[in-house]
Interface confidence: low
């Protein structure tokens, strides 16, 4: 006869490990008892359990409550046991010794491998601002046994670097994603992907990128200067910019206070029926926590009685 077992049994942390040991004997042979022990090199053998054909299962105190026989129906030649709730410390070599009648004793060894699925964590880097050089966007760390794979899934252009720490029973992997911040990255997902044999599917942690910026400001509303004439109603100037965080707008007049009746509504400056008093230089000031921008325009209100048109100057400054 001979013993049938596995060279390696792989189980995920917390699962039950079946340690197989089956005696394939000739007709009429019987198994008297099966002894299980842990036999890691450098340590004395530590008995787990004894399966006796007459007296049943005896579990050693160190494994009390953790070693069981597989559920029925059971073959009398099957000496397999279940190790409940496998932990990292269970990883190692195990031996089953089978006493048979009349063939004698047999023994076989197997290695138990306990996979520790990683618990990844993603840490965003410092605040991203347009104009910075290569900057850490995020780092992702995962620790497990064996070492997990940490990669990045994103449409954003960047560079990655990884490092690994080997521990006695596990390995930690940290991957960093660096990029040159630009406004186009705002709202883009940066996903850390962790692969590991102990996971049914890859674990993914997504970080949404936020890049602080402020676009140049420009003023709309003066495209057709002929519309800016005395008496015109509904004239308005609109300040255009965009930023992250969203900017606030402020209107001033360079050559004096805003005329009475002019309404400021955020990015829009609304005029009452135009008079020559509304002629002047208007400044839109755009700001957020990152930066500030100015754009100024010269408004010249035309008198319809006059034939000659007047030029309009647009000046942007930041």
């Amino acid at each position: 006869g001979e013993l049938e077992t596995s060279d390696v049994v792989t189980v995920v942390l917390g699962q039950d490990a079946k340690l197989p040991c089956f005696y394939r004997g000739d007709s009429g042979e019987q198994v008297g008892q099966v002894a299980w022990a842990r036999v890691d090199a450098g340590e004395g053998a530590q008995e787990l359990a004894l399966l006796h054909s007459k007296y049943g299962l005896h579990v050693s105190p160190a494994y009390e409550g953790r070693v069981e026989q597989p559920p029925p129906p059971r073959n009398p030649l099957d000496g397999s046991v279940l190790l409940r709730n496998a932990v990292q410390a269970d990883e190692g070599e195990y031996e089953c010794r089978v006493s048979t009648f009349p063939a004698g004793s047999f023994q076989a060894r197997l290695r138990l491998r306990v996979l520790v699925p990683p618990l990844p964590s993603l840490n965003p880097g410092p605040a991203l601002e347009e104009g910075q050089g290569l900057t850490l966007a995020a780092s992702c760390t995962a620790e497990g046994s064996p070492a997990p794979s940490v990669t990045w899934d994103t449409e954003v252009k960047g560079t990655t670097s990884s490092r690994s720490f080997k521990h006695s029973r596990s390995a930690a992997v940290t991957s960093e994603f660096h990029l040159v911040p630009s406004r186009s990255m705002n709202g883009q997902p940066l996903t850390c992907v962790v692969s590991h044999p102990g996971l049914l599917q890859d674990q993914r942690i997504t970080h949404i990128l936020h890049v602080s910026f402020l676009a140049e400001a420009s003023v709309r509303g003066l495209e057709d200067q002929n519309l800016w004439h005395i008496g015109r109603e509904g004239a308005m100037l609109k300040c255009l910019s965009e930023g992250q965080p969203p900017p606030s707008y402020n209107w001033t007049r360079l050559d004096g206070p805003l005329p009475s009746g002019v309404r400021v509504d955020g990015d829009t400056l609304g005029f009452p029926p135009l008079t020559t008093e509304h002629s002047g230089i208007y400044v839109c000031h755009v700001s957020n926590e990152f930066s500030s921008r100015d754009s100024q325009v010269t408004v010249d209100v035309l008198d319809p009685q006059e034939d000659s048109g007047k030029q309009v100057d647009l000046v942007s400054a930041s």
Partner: antibody, heavy 126, light 107 residues
């Protein structure tokens, strides 16, 4: 306020033993790896040993491996260093220090040491 | 083990001076470097971590730079309380190792 207070230093003969303690307060002790660092008189800093937040992983400098044992009691917020077979070259001020962060409590990940105790002097001499 | 070499071993400077200390690693350690300040009879104090990040509560006159194997600690304008010994430490891998120290003395 984070505080680390070492105790247990003193004069001991070569071959003798000593147990250092470090009482921690002001932070969640079990969340942080802890380290021992020593400084011989007039010399620089030498990392001695570290232990993960849970106590499951320990690391030692080659110079103390097999002689020193680091441990912690998270219920008492206390870190220990058991020093056996002491030698003259172990004479130093021993500092306990908190690792700045810990990724996982069951493994040790070297990080900067952001809080240090005041130190306790260990003198090994006959 | 990774060896950390600081230079100079000591330097003399006056209040207001700009002081630079360098630290070289025997192999690449990315940005996993910390700087500490130690005054006589006192425990070390963390100044800089991750090569260039300022620890909370540390004055902005201290700054760090570098990556790979070469790193620098700069004190932009030396103050009386800055006369001390400065150590670099790699936290890239175990065992974490310190430089031999640089003593900043009053000229």
């Amino acid at each position: 306020e984070v505080q680390l207070v070492e105790s247990g230093g003193g004069l001991v003969q070569p071959g003798g033993s000593l147990r250092l303690s470090c009482a921690a307060s002001g932070f969640t002790f079990s969340s942080y790896a802890m380290s021992w660092v020593r400084q011989a008189p007039g010399k620089g800093l030498e990392w001695v040993s570290a232990i993960s937040g849970s106590g499951g992983s320990t690391y030692y400098a080659d110079s103390v491996k097999g002689r020193f044992t680091i441990s912690r009691d998270n219920s008492k917020n206390t870190l220990y260093l058991q020093m056996n077979s002491l030698r003259a070259e172990d004479t130093a001020v021993y500092y306990c220090a908190r690792d700045r962060s810990d990724v996982y409590s069951y493994s040790y990940f070297p990080t900067p040491l952001d809080y240090w105790g005041q130190g306790t002097l260990v003198t090994v001499s006959s | 083990d990774i060896q950390m070499t600081q230079s100079p071993s000591s330097l003399s400077a006056s209040v207001g001076d700009r002081v630079t200390i360098t630290c070289r690693a025997s192999q690449g350690i990315s940005s996993y470097l910390a700087w500490y300040q130690q005054k006589p009879g006192k425990a070390p104090k963390l100044l800089i971590y991750a090569a260039s990040s300022l620890q909370s509560g540390v004055p902005s006159r201290f700054s760090g730079s570098g990556s790979g194997t070469d790193f620098t600690l700069t004190i932009s304008s030396l103050q009386p309380e800055d006369f001390a010994t400065y150590y670099c430490q790699q936290h890239y891998t175990t065992p974490p190792t310190f430089g031999q120290g640089t003593k900043v003395e009053i000229k």
